[in-house]
Every structure is written in C-alpha cells, then in structure tokens.
C-alpha cells in the first residue's frame, strides 16, 4: 500500500459514496448517501487528513422506522400517540372552535416496501369558520326598514323610519353584530302615532295679554 | 348518556407520584375525548391535558408537561393520569371530562392531598 | 393563552331579580361556554356555543356576546340559581376558565 494516501473507503451496506472512486490524497472529501428507507447514522461526509487518516469512522445505513413530524397546524390542536412517530403512530389534529377543518383530521405514518415510511396524508388546514348572518327584521307598523333583505351579513346595518304622523320609539339603526351566532345590537324600534296631546304636552303656551277694553274699535281691528 | 367514575382520593407525601383512574361507562367510550381538569383550593380551573381512546393519542397543556402523563386503556374504557413530583400546589380536585370544546359530562373528582 | 376576565367575582340577588354576569377576553373568541357548580360537586356543562341552554337548564338562563365580550343572564332569579359561574373558551391553545362568578341568593 502507498503511504502518501488514506486508506480505501469500503462500500456501506444500503447506501452508497461518491465519488465511487475517490483519490484518497490529502483533501478528498467523500459523500456517503443511503438508499430510500435509510437514514445515515454517523458523519456522511469524511475528509482525508494531513496525517493521512479519514477525519471521520465510516458511517452505516439504518433502516428508517418513522415518519418525520408532520408539524403544527395554525389554529388547532394535535394529539399525539407516540412522540417519535413510529410506523404505527397517529396524530389527530382537532381545529379550534371558529374554525373548520379541511383534509384529514388523523393521519397514521405507514410503512413501505421501498423508501421512508410516508404518513397517510399531508396535514389538514383549519380555515375560519363563516360567520352566520342575521335574519331579517320586519319594518315596523306604519314605518319602513332598509334595506329590505331576509338576511344580512354580519357587520350590516339596517335602518328604520316611520310613516307621517308617527314618531320612532327605539333605535333609527341596529347592527348586525358579528359573532357564533350572529345577533342585532338592539331590539328592533317601534313607530308611535304623534299625538296632539303629545304635541301640546311637548311646547308651552305663551299667551299675550290684552290690552285694557275699549268702548270703540279700531277700523284696524 | 356516558358516565364516569374516578378513583378515591389520595394524601401524598412531597415527591411522590400519584395515578388516578376515570372509567367511562354507559356509552361508547371512544366517541369522545376524555379531558383532565384541575381545581384548586382557589376554586380555579385549569385544563390539564385530553386523550383520544380511539387512537391513543395524548395533547398536553404545556403547563402540565413533565409534571402529568395521560394514558387510556381502551378494553377497560379507563383513562388515567399519574401525577410526579408532588408539590403542595399539587394539592386539588382533578376532574375528568368528555367533550371536544367544552365539557359535556364531568366526572365526580379525585381529591388529591400533598402533606408531609 | 386567553384570560378571562367575569365580574362580578361575587353578587347577590332577590327572588325574581333579573341578574347577569359577563365575561370578558383578553382575545377575541368565537364561542363562549358556561358551567355551573355548587358546593362540593362537580360543574356542569350550563351554557354552550355562547347560547345554547344544555339539557335540563331552565329557559330563563341565556347567554350572548361576540368577540371579547359575553354574558350569562337570568331573567328572574331563582333559589336554586345559586351556585358559582365559570365561562370558558377553546378559540385557541389551551382552553381556559374565567375565575368565576359566585351568584348568592339575598
């Protein structure tokens, strides 16, 4: 054997280096890779030193026998059968209240003839839930709303008035506040006929005084 | 409707552990989640933790990690959660629930006493 | 995680009194659930979905709210109303638990 190189790099059961022929001088650097369904343990990349010995113990191929974590899901919950998903394992993933899910709640990490184990779909989503709409209100007796829908999207405003000769008794406008369910701000108003009563009861008379009687009248008069 | 049945209580001594049990019955036992909830001499709730009986799987509140560990028994219809390392702030009333979001049916409460 | 925030911790009302008690996020929240529990048993599920009753719960409870701000009202208060109010949400990670509020019969 030469002795101004390293010594050879074997072949690793399951994988295999590159260059497959490397010089094995001072600098050389050789990659080693394992087939699919294998994992490198050890150091995959080894350097031919000054002294002439490899910088690294030759690694091995080990069988992989779990899934890689199929991560967090924003807005839900996961929960977790085996922490280091083995082939076997399962995660379910639950959404947190508001919001809906769309794909696979539980996934299962299986195994395969060639190549990593795979879980059984990719990871949900958790998309927010739609907010519902508020039903809509009847107009009031002798009065009006608008617009005149059935149903009104959450954050929508309706407005009231009343006919001629009636007052509002209530809020002019109500909101659709949004929420699980949505629901109107206030109650809807009521339309009240403007009374005279009510008309005189809200001013105050003020009556002039007359001037002393006289036995003649003005033509002016 | 399910009903569920917990362990006695239980005095500890500081650095123990503690395993309390909540057997399901009544229903199907896997249609639910079961939830562990704690309750304080403060009368506060805390969520502790949930297990799946139907897969096995386990969600903890991180608060909790390392200090509860869920398991179920799905041919017994049991959950259990033990509890290390006892603390007088360990000293409560532990509930067991079903639900999903909220809690449907609770269980009667294990009343745990650390004390030296 | 979300606090919640119920007032009045404590309160105290006459036969038939209207009473409501809030509960207040410090996030906004989709739902709102509420529990009842007396003293010494465990609580149960009263309030769910912010307003739907659970089964047995007499109609003059009802809640409402949206967002960070919800209620629990008791159209005319009864002797057996009394007992300790929890809300609850699971809008996100972990769900948590209002303080309470303790409801007593004057």
């Known amino acids: 054997p030469r002795n101004d190189t390293c010594p050879e790099l074997p072949e690793i059961p399951n994988g295999w280096k590159s260059p497959s022929q490397p010089e094995l001088v001072h600098g050389t650097v050789v990659t080693y890779q394992c087939y699919p369904g294998y994992q490198v343990v050890g150091s995959s990349v080894l350097m031919c030193q000054w002294d002439l010995t490899w910088s690294e113990d030759l690694p091995s191929c080990q069988r992989v026998t779990s899934c890689h974590d199929p991560g967090d899901v924003e807005h839900s919950r996961r929960l977790i059968s085996s922490p280091k998903f083995p082939v076997g394992a399962t995660v379910q993933y639950i959404c947190d209240q508001g919001f809906v899910l769309m794909g696979s709640s539980i996934l299962t990490c299986h195994d395969r003839q060639a190549g990593s184990p795979k879980w059984s779909d990719r990871a949900p989503k958790c998309l927010l839930e739609q907010l519902k709409p508020c039903h809509g209100l009847s107009a009031p007796e002798n009065g009006a709303r608008s617009p005149e829908k059935q149903l009104h999207p959450a954050g929508a405003t309706i407005h009231f008035s009343c006919a001629p000769g009636y007052v509002l008794k209530g809020q002019a406008s109500i909101k659709c506040v949004p929420g699980h369910p949505s629901h109107w701000s206030d109650p809807p108003p009521i339309c009240r006929a403007a009374s005279l009563d009510g008309f005189y009861n809200s001013r105050s008379l003020d009556v002039a005084k007359a001037p002393a009687a006289s036995s003649t009248l003005d033509a002016a008069h | 409707e399910v009903q569920l049945q917990q362990s006695g209580p239980e005095l500890m001594k500081p650095g123990a552990s503690v395993k309390m049990s909540c057997k399901a019955s009544?229903?199907?036992?896997?249609?639910?989640?079961i939830h562990w909830v704690k309750q304080n001499q403060g009368k506060s709730l805390e969520w502790i933790g949930e297990v799946n009986p139907n897969i096995g799987g386990i969600g903890y509140n991180q608060k909790f990690k390392g200090k509860a560990t869920l398991t179920v028994d799905k041919s017994s219809s049991t959950a259990y959660m033990e509890l290390r390392s006892l603390t007088s702030e360990d000293s409560a009333v532990y509930y067991c629930?079903?639900?999903?979001?909220?809690?449907?049916?609770w269980g009667a409460g294990t009343t745990v006493t650390v004390s030296s | 995680q979300i606090v919640l925030t119920q007032s009045p911790a404590i309160m105290s009302a006459s036969p038939g009194e209207k009473v409501t008690m809030t509960c207040s996020a410090s996030?906004?929240?989709?739902?709102m659930h509420w529990y009842q529990q007396k003293s010494g048993t465990s609580p149960k599920r009263w309030i769910y979905?912010?307003?739907k009753l659970a089964s047995g719960v007499p109609p003059r409870f009802s809640g409402r709210g949206s967002g960070t701000s919800y209620s629990l009202t008791i159209s005319s208060m009864e002797a057996e109303d009394a007992a300790t109010y929890y809300c609850?949400?699971?809008?996100?990670?972990?769900?948590?638990f209002g303080a309470g509020t303790k409801l007593e019969m004057k």
């Open positions: 009544g229903d199907t036992f896997t249609d639910y989640n």
């Open positions: 609850q949400h699971w809008s996100s990670n972990p769900p948590t």
């Open positions: 979905d912010t307003s």
């Open positions: 629930a079903m639900g999903r979001w909220y809690f449907d049916v």
């Open positions: 996030s906004s929240v989709s739902y």
